[in-house]
């Protein structure tokens, strides 16, 4: 297993609809054809997997149907979008990139993006 540098923004403020988008960029030391991207959430020293996708270079990222993540890739950049976030989901989201094929296997873990989510004001009741 060889180390690889992964860059991601330090802080992201989610949209009022609870959507956070950011770029995860990795310094690929070789010509990988198969890449796996995982988003991890760290809270109180607990690390949980938010979502993961494996893709072939030049193709779309495919997350599971019930995933809260979507994404696209462009060269060594992965554009990640996490949806359905609430204030309670505020936390550190870490981008992990693995170059799966061809060998050698490379692993890179970013420093994390602190995502802040502010729940919008509820709309006042209306007759309309």
């Amino acid at each position: 297993c060889k180390a690889m540098h992964v860059a991601q923004p330090a802080v992201v403020l989610a949209s009022s609809r609870g959507i956070a988008s950011f770029v995860c960029e990795y310094a690929s030391p070789g010509k990988a054809t198969e890449v796996r991207v995982t988003v991890l959430r760290q809270a109180d020293s607990q690390v949980t997997e938010v979502c993961a996708a494996t893709y072939m270079m030049g193709n779309e990222l495919t997350f599971l149907d019930d995933s809260i993540c979507t994404g696209t890739s462009s060269g060594n950049q992965v554009n990640l979008t996490i949806q359905g976030l609430r204030a309670m989901d505020t936390g550190l989201y870490i981008c992990k990139v693995e170059l799966m094929y061809p060998p050698p296997y490379y692993l890179g873990i970013g420093n994390g993006t602190q995502i802040y989510v502010i729940d919008p004001e509820p709309c006042p009741d209306s007759d309309f």
Epitope: P9, A10, V11, V12, L13, A14, S15, S16, R17, I19, A20, S21, F22, V23, N79, T81
Partner: nanobody, 117 residues
């Protein structure tokens, strides 16, 4: 790169007011104020984007007002009815909007606000 310079911090009695300013070297879609008290995590205070959409932390709603002068590329935070809990280092941050969310890539050095009872 965007350079940010905060000013306006200081010491004030509880119930008092302060106005923070942040001068940016160039325009960015998103600007906001964050704060960090000793031993605590950094938290978002208020934010404004190109909408202009504003967001406030629950703890400051009704007391703090964020505004931006686009002609001067300057961000402001009017703070009134200050409480000792508002004591912290206040940071100005800026960055682009990406798919509706703000990526805060640029940070100022911070200005200290101390509220005594």
């Amino acid at each position: 790169q965007v350079q940010l310079q905060e000013s306006g911090g200081g010491s004030v009695q509880a119930g008092g007011s302060l106005r923070l300013s942040c001068a940016a070297s160039k325009y960015t879609s998103c600007m906001g104020w964050f704060r960090q008290a000793p031993g605590k995590e950094r938290e978002v205070v208020a934010h404004i984007d190109s909408g202009p959409r504003t967001l406030y932390a629950d703890s400051v709603k009704g007391r703090f007002t964020i505004s931006k002068d686009n002609a001067k590329n300057t961000l402001y935070l009017e703070m009134s009815t200050l409480k000792p809990d508002d004591t912290a280092m206040y940071y100005c941050a800026a960055g682009p909007m990406y798919s509706g969310s703000c990526n805060y890539n640029y940070w100022g050095q911070g200005t200290q606000v101390t509220v005594s009872s």
